[in-house]
Interface confidence: medium
């Protein structure tokens, strides 16, 4: 598995090197998570051919995958630092459950499935440090999220596949989305 | 081919209206960040705009903010640069470019670019 | 917008020397930098992303460094075609440029 923020020969190499501010350990939080996911298209894109798939074709697919809309704040029109956050916050712990689905998804790739889900959790812990209204944060419901896993580990081979190239594509967007807000913070 | 192609210059007096436009071909515009730069003659460049493809989010230079307007056309693999109430400092070579999408992004692609001059 | 400062604004140098162009940013922007080179009545051409990564097709003799708000851009041995102006950018807020660094032929 890919060496975790903080931890790559670089940072061994330059122990006197400034400590990592609160905004460059998420950006770099981020980063490591994208790289990762970058990973897991590969392999998704070897094995099947939904990185070919129009958007229309993959828009027909009903998954209620987070993402950001200009009432959340986070656009650089109408910017609400507060309600960004828990856009972000809310959005990645709605995105849990489908990455606890890409856990059986991946044959070479198994363990960069288990860091992107690892660090997903790490990312959120920083994110609630940084928020101040944590009461406007809504978790989901664990009963619906089981039965939502249930569901979509159900679906035929096909079905499997394109949620995973969904799944994959959305989480990409919506931390890119979030890295582009994050920045004005 | 991978390109993009520039449209939309000219002489324009100050206080008017200009829209460039950018027609990509070899790549969709609806899952890539697009740029606009632009080049005053003889000085340096300067980030003008930036659209990113998720949910179409614009970013204005401070320089340009509630003048101008970058939008897109997906059906038309084409984006704009609506320019209002023009002066004389926005005279310049315009590129429309591509952020590679990567993290961070960088412009991996540029238009010819297209000259905009507002004089009276 | 995030001022990025570019220093020398002039350059004067020989074939074969080793020249280097600094870049400082108003704030720290990780490593969210790009350097550029453009030739006259050209658009510019990328070198350098991620502050350090070499883009494909670009001679091993550019490299640059840095990271949070300090980058460089080396040259460890100029050719003839490396006479340009040369600019950094940022993509961390916006994408503000340098002022860019003009390499001529001393």
């Known amino acids: 598995a890919p060496v975790p923020p903080g931890e790559d020969s670089k940072d061994v190499a330059a122990p006197h090197r400034q400590p990592l501010t609160s905004s460059e350990r998420i950006d770099k939080q981020i980063r490591y998570i994208l790289d990762g996911i970058s990973a897991l298209r590969k392999e998704t894109c070897n094995k099947s051919n939904m990185c070919e798939s129009s958007k229309e074709a993959l828009a027909e697919n009903n998954l209620n995958l987070p993402k950001m809309a200009e009432k959340d704040g986070c656009f650089q029109s109408g910017f609400n630092e507060e309600t960004c956050l828990v856009k972000i916050i809310t959005g990645l712990l709605e995105f849990e459950v489908y990455l606890e689905y890409l856990q059986n998804r991946f044959e070479s790739s198994e363990e960069q499935a288990r860091a992107v889900q690892m660090s997903t959790k790490v990312l959120i812990q920083f994110l609630q440090k940084k928020a101040k209204n944590l009461d406007a944060i809504t978790t989901p419901d664990p009963t619906t999220n089981a039965s939502l896993l249930t569901k979509l580990q159900a679906q035929n081979q096909w079905l499997q596949d394109m949620t995973t190239h969904l799944i994959l594509r959305s989480f990409k967007e919506f931390l890119q989305s979030s890295l582009r807000a994050l920045r004005q913070m | 081919e991978v390109q993009l192609v520039q449209s939309g210059g000219g002489l324009i007096q100050p206080g008017g209206s200009l829209r460039l436009s950018c027609a990509a071909s070899?790549?969709?515009?609806?899952?890539?960040?697009m740029i606009w730069v632009r080049q005053a003659p003889g000085k340096g460049l300067e980030w003008v705009s930036d659209?990113?493809?998720?949910?179409?989010?614009?970013y204005y230079a401070d320089s340009v903010k509630g003048r101008f307007t970058m939008s897109r056309d997906i059906s038309k693999n084409t984006v704009y640069l609506q320019m209002n109430s023009l002066r004389a400092e926005d005279t310049g070579v315009y590129y429309c470019?591509?952020?590679?999408?990567?993290?961070?992004?960088?412009?991996?692609?540029w238009g010819r670019g297209t000259l905009v001059t507002v004089s009276s | 917008d995030i001022v990025m400062t570019q220093s020398p604004s002039t350059l004067s140098a020989s074939v074969g020397d080793r020249v280097t162009i600094t870049c400082r940013a108003s704030?720290?922007?990780?490593?969210?930098l790009a350097w550029y080179q453009q030739k006259p009545g050209r658009a510019p051409k990328v070198l350098i992303y991620?502050?350090?990564t070499l883009e494909s097709g670009v001679p091993s003799r550019f490299s640059g460094s840095g990271s949070g708000t300090d980058f460089t851009l080396t040259i460890s041995s100029l050719q003839p075609e490396d006479f340009a102006t040369y600019y950094c950018?940022?993509?961390?807020?916006?994408?503000?440029f340098g002022q860019g660094t003009k390499l001529e032929i001393k």
């Open positions: 991620k502050a350090s």
């Open positions: 659209l990113y493809y998720y949910a179409g989010d614009t």
């Open positions: 950018q940022q993509s961390w807020l916006g994408g503000s």
């Open positions: 070899g790549f969709t515009i609806s899952s890539n960040y």
């Open positions: 470019a591509r952020w590679a999408d990567d993290h961070p992004p960088y412009i991996d692609l």
């Open positions: 704030q720290g922007i990780s490593s969210w």
